[in-house]
Amino acid sequence: FSGSEATAAILSRAPWSLQSVNPGLKTNSSKEPKFTKCRSPERETFSCHWTDEVHHGTKNLGPIQLFYTRRNTQEWTQEWKECPDYVSAGENSCYFNSSFTSIWIPYCIKLTSNGGTVDEKCFSVDEIVQPDPPIALNWTLLNVSLTGIHADIQVRWEAPRNADIQKGWMVLEYELQYKEVNETKWKMMDPILTTSVPVYSLKVDKEYEVRVRSKQRNSGNYGEFSEVLYVTLPQMSQFTCEEDFY
């Protein structure tokens, strides 16, 4: 997480006050467990993760527990409830299924050990949306230049399976990146709202890597990249007549 630290004052200052956090990683400079990330892949569930490296070698720290509260109405619910599921999202995590998740209210979470709070954060679900990677990447040839040196391709993909695109619950924007296989720096294309995009002027004698990632439009952060799609453009002699491509 980055941004200002949330403390118990969050809940006492005003019943609906909320300090927002960025879901990005935060370096754990202290010796106590810290939240590292909260993420919702599809606005219907979310999970939070924390560090626990030092904890293994520290005798005076008790078991780490996560508690949460959400502002359901008029005031923050005064009771903190314990994490509903420590298992489904892996080690040092808490998973909130769809019954516990709504984008329409703010949440606060805290990590405790021996009854004391060691870290605390507040957020709304939309701020922590990071979609799963796009899937089923493929490409087709659009055309080849008259010189036979360059070619244009169309790259297509599908939204992650758990993203409810049809009902408009998620509106994803996509970022495509590509590079020659032996290069280190990726070329970035402008974000788009469609699931296909042309890539122009690729060299026909080179092999390219293409990857795509997505984010919820107007909120959240980019998710992980898709698996890399390899694009090999054969030499000009392997193509049929140039005229066929125009």
């Epitope: 609906w16 909320l18 109405t73 008029q74």
Partner: antibody
Framework: EVQLVESGGGLVKPGGSLRLSCAAS????????MDWVRQAPGKGLEWVAE??????????YYAESVKGRFTISRDDSKNTLYLQMNSLKTEDTAVYYC??????WGQGTLVTVSS | EIVLTQSPGTLSLSPGERATLSCTAT???????LNWYQQKPGQAPRLLIY???NLASGIPDRFSGSGSGTDFTLTISRLEPEDFAVYYC?????????FGGGTKVEIK
């Protein structure tokens, strides 16, 4: 005590514009998530729009029926919520309520769209 | 969106009687995110119950709520004269927040 007082309603022709205001007091306005909810004459309640706090980047949300025509905004220094309504239609005729988290409600202001 | 259907549309009862109001959702709503409101003529809605069964501040305990999934109920154990009003259910779980069409509780 939470108080929400709406103003700015009135009679407007179809295609016209109107800006509603909601003066808030009795709570920390800058921390609050605020909504507009409307009620057509003799009908039920319809959620219109929401704006979140500065801590939440003043994120805004709209009902499909008003998206692209209405804009919710706020001035935290004045403890005031706004609803800018453009391209008004006859079906926008309603009492517009300003609400805090849809828990506390103002008394509403009537908007009539008619030629 | 999740559509909330309230029944009956109108409930005609006498003071002292028990009122049972129903709210049915087109898809499952977590009990944490369902509220009930009361509205009297010429007044703004007032929050009665939040999270299906919790009484809002200042609401008398003759009001109670229950339910889960797609079926929710508001019960008024003994109707007082001031309880005759329109009642709305409201969900803020998935999609955009929606309200039911309302149930009018009138004096018989």
């Amino acid at each position: 005590e939470v108080q929400l007082v709406e103003s700015g309603g009135g009679l407007v022709k179809p295609g016209g514009s109107l800006r509603l205001s909601c003066a808030a007091s009795g709570f920390t306005f800058s921390d609050a998530w605020m909504d507009w909810v409307r009620q057509a004459p003799g009908k039920g309640l319809e959620w219109v729009a929401e704006i979140r706090s500065k801590a939440n980047n003043h994120a805004t949300y709209y009902a499909e029926s008003v998206k692209g025509r209405f804009t919710i905004s706020r001035d935290d220094s004045k403890n005031t919520l706004y609803l800018q309504m453009n391209s008004l239609k006859t079906e926008d005729t309603a009492v517009y309520y300003c609400t805090l988290f849809r828990d506390y409600w103002g008394q509403g202001t009537l908007v009539t769209v008619s030629s | 969106e999740i559509v909330l259907t309230q029944s009956p549309g109108t409930l005609s009862l006498s003071p002292g009687e028990r009122a049972t109001l129903s709210c049915t959702a087109t898809s499952s709503v977590s009990s944490s995110y369902l509220n009930w409101y009361q509205q009297k003529p010429g007044q703004a809605p007032r929050l009665l119950i939040y999270s299906t069964s919790n009484l809002a501040s200042g609401i008398p305990d003759r009001f109670s709520g229950s339910g889960s999934g797609t079926d929710f109920t508001l019960t008024i154990s003994r109707l007082e004269p001031e309880d005759f009003a329109v009642y709305y259910c409201h969900q803020y779980h998935r999609f955009t927040p929606t309200f039911g069409g309302g149930t009018k509780v009138e004096i018989k």
